[in-house]
């Protein structure tokens, strides 16, 4: 799997989990998440060869029609597989609030 | 929706379907597939601005990052969202067999 | 230009549920909470509650909770305020209202034209 | 529940005149070093506009006629060079604890 496990502590070029630290106020704008201040969402990158982590048979065939015309523009794209929630604290008013976020960080990555 | 109804009739430059056309011998190398010869499988592509069909939480708040840091790698992609069946011909000898090639059309695109 | 554009006029009957929608357009819809606030004919302002579209968190002022649900559509960037078991008290203009932005409950920077709700049998 | 008491209930003021409109909380609105009170003006037949924010920060697109101050319990709006305009409800509003609310307006 192209997950945190393996492409965190590998040198892999092509479509894995790379990391990625968002801070809420600098990279979103958003002022009014208490806890935490970021977090590690991580994101996709990396090229699509045939036959690599591929997550439809139309991604297969994409990819191997690629395979026979290099110059298409045509190609399967690296992205998010398995993403996990992130809990946050923000207040309103004086009381504090624990919430949930859904789909924020992202753990494994396929091409698409 | 980012479906062939509006992609097809748009001259839209971010995420669409577009159009394509793949010849299962020429381009896939297939030659076991008696009919049909090929068949519009259509692909996805372009830019997936802040907000463009954006597909879980975790592609919003990526995009927003994006905005915030034009420069980044990290960014969400253009890729498939429905995807449809293609029945296609083939034999056994010389007996016809039909199937159902699934998710083998693309319909519709995301950003993800 | 940052709208927020509200549905229009409703007369209902006692007991009956109403839906306000707030359509908005120039700011990202989904990143901002926002408020619903009602001024009944001649009276002050009343904070009903607030919702942050991208994960449907909602907070509720205790005075209306169980009658007001806010939910949001991000694909339409539209927030909805629905109210039920409506009585002659609840006659009002209910206006959507967009945070400020730097806290969850926050000064309302933009506002909708608001929505005239009528109870009558 | 905070109570917000403005003072006076409705005013009447020549133009080129200077206004003060008084907003009391049953508590103090202080926390993290910020006064948690706004100030908005309704005119007739139109919704409320922002005008303060944070008890003395101006609002973008806003006359500087206008001015707050004050802080924990006690705050001010003041409306220097009052215009024919500047006609409406002033209605000041917490943020420091749920729920937020508004004062009954000042006319």
């Known amino acids: 799997a192209l997950d945190t496990n393996y492409c965190f502590s590998s040198t892999e070029k092509n479509c894995c989990v790379r990391q990625l630290y968002i801070d809420f106020r600098k990279d979103l704008g958003w002022k009014w998440i208490h806890e935490p201040k970021g977090y590690h969402a991580n994101f996709c990158l990396g090229p699509c060869p045939y036959i690599w982590s591929l997550d439809t048979q139309y991604s297969k065939v994409l990819a191997l029609y690629n395979q026979h015309n290099p110059g298409a523009s045509a190609a399967p794209c690296c992205v998010p597989q398995a993403l996990e929630p992130l809990p946050i604290v923000y207040y309103v008013g004086r009381k504090p609030k624990v919430e949930q976020l859904s789909n924020m960080i992202v753990r494994s990555c396929k091409c698409s | 929706a980012l479906d062939t109804n509006y992609c097809f009739s748009s001259t839209e430059k971010n995420c669409c379907v577009r159009q394509l056309y793949i010849d299962f011998r020429k381009d896939l190398g297939w030659k076991w597939i008696h009919e049909p010869k090929g068949y519009h499988a259509n692909f996805c592509l372009g830019p997936c601005p802040y907000i463009w069909s954006l597909d879980t939480q975790y592609s919003k708040v990526l995009a927003l990052y994006n905005q915030h840091n034009p420069g980044a790698s990290a960014a969400p992609c253009c890729v498939p969202q429905a995807l449809e069946p293609l029945p296609i011909v083939y034999y056994v000898g010389r007996k016809p067999k039909v199937e159902q090639l699934s998710n083998m059309i693309v319909r519709s695109c995301k950003c993800s | 230009e940052v709208q927020l554009v509200q549905s229009g006029a409703e007369v209902k009957k006692p007991g009956a549920s109403v839906k306000v929608s707030c359509k908005t357009s120039g700011y990202t819809f989904m990143f901002y909470w926002m408020n619903w606030v009602r001024q009944a004919p001649g009276a002050g302002l009343d904070w009903m509650g607030q919702i942050f579209p991208a994960w449907g968190m909602t907070n509720y002022n205790e005075m209306f909770e169980g009658r007001v649900t806010l939910t949001a559509d991000t694909s339409t960037s539209t927030a909805y305020m629905e109210l039920s078991s409506l009585r002659a008290g609840d006659i009002a203009v209910y206006y959507c209202a967009r945070g400020y932005g730097n806290y969850a409950l926050d000064a309302m920077d933009y506002w909708g034209q608001g929505t005239l709700v009528t109870v009558s049998s | 529940d905070i109570v917000m008491t403005q003072t006076p209930p409705s005013l009447s003021v020549s133009p080129r005149e200077t206004a003060s409109i008084s907003c009391r909380a049953s508590?103090?609105?202080?926390?993290?070093?910020?006064?948690?009170m706004h100030w908005y003006l309704q005119k007739p037949g139109q919704s409320p506009q922002l005008l303060i924010y944070?008890?003395?920060n101006l609002e973008s697109g806003v006359s500087d006629r206008f001015s707050g101050s004050g802080s924990g319990t006690d705050f001010t709006l003041r409306i220097s060079r009052v215009e024919a305009n500047d006609t409406g409800v002033y209605y000041c509003?917490?943020?420091?604890?749920?729920?937020?609310?508004f004062g009954q307006g000042t006319k």
């Open positions: 944070l008890a003395s």
């Open positions: 508590e103090s609105v202080d926390s993290y070093g910020n006064s948690f």
């Open positions: 509003q917490q943020n420091d604890e749920d729920p937020l609310s």
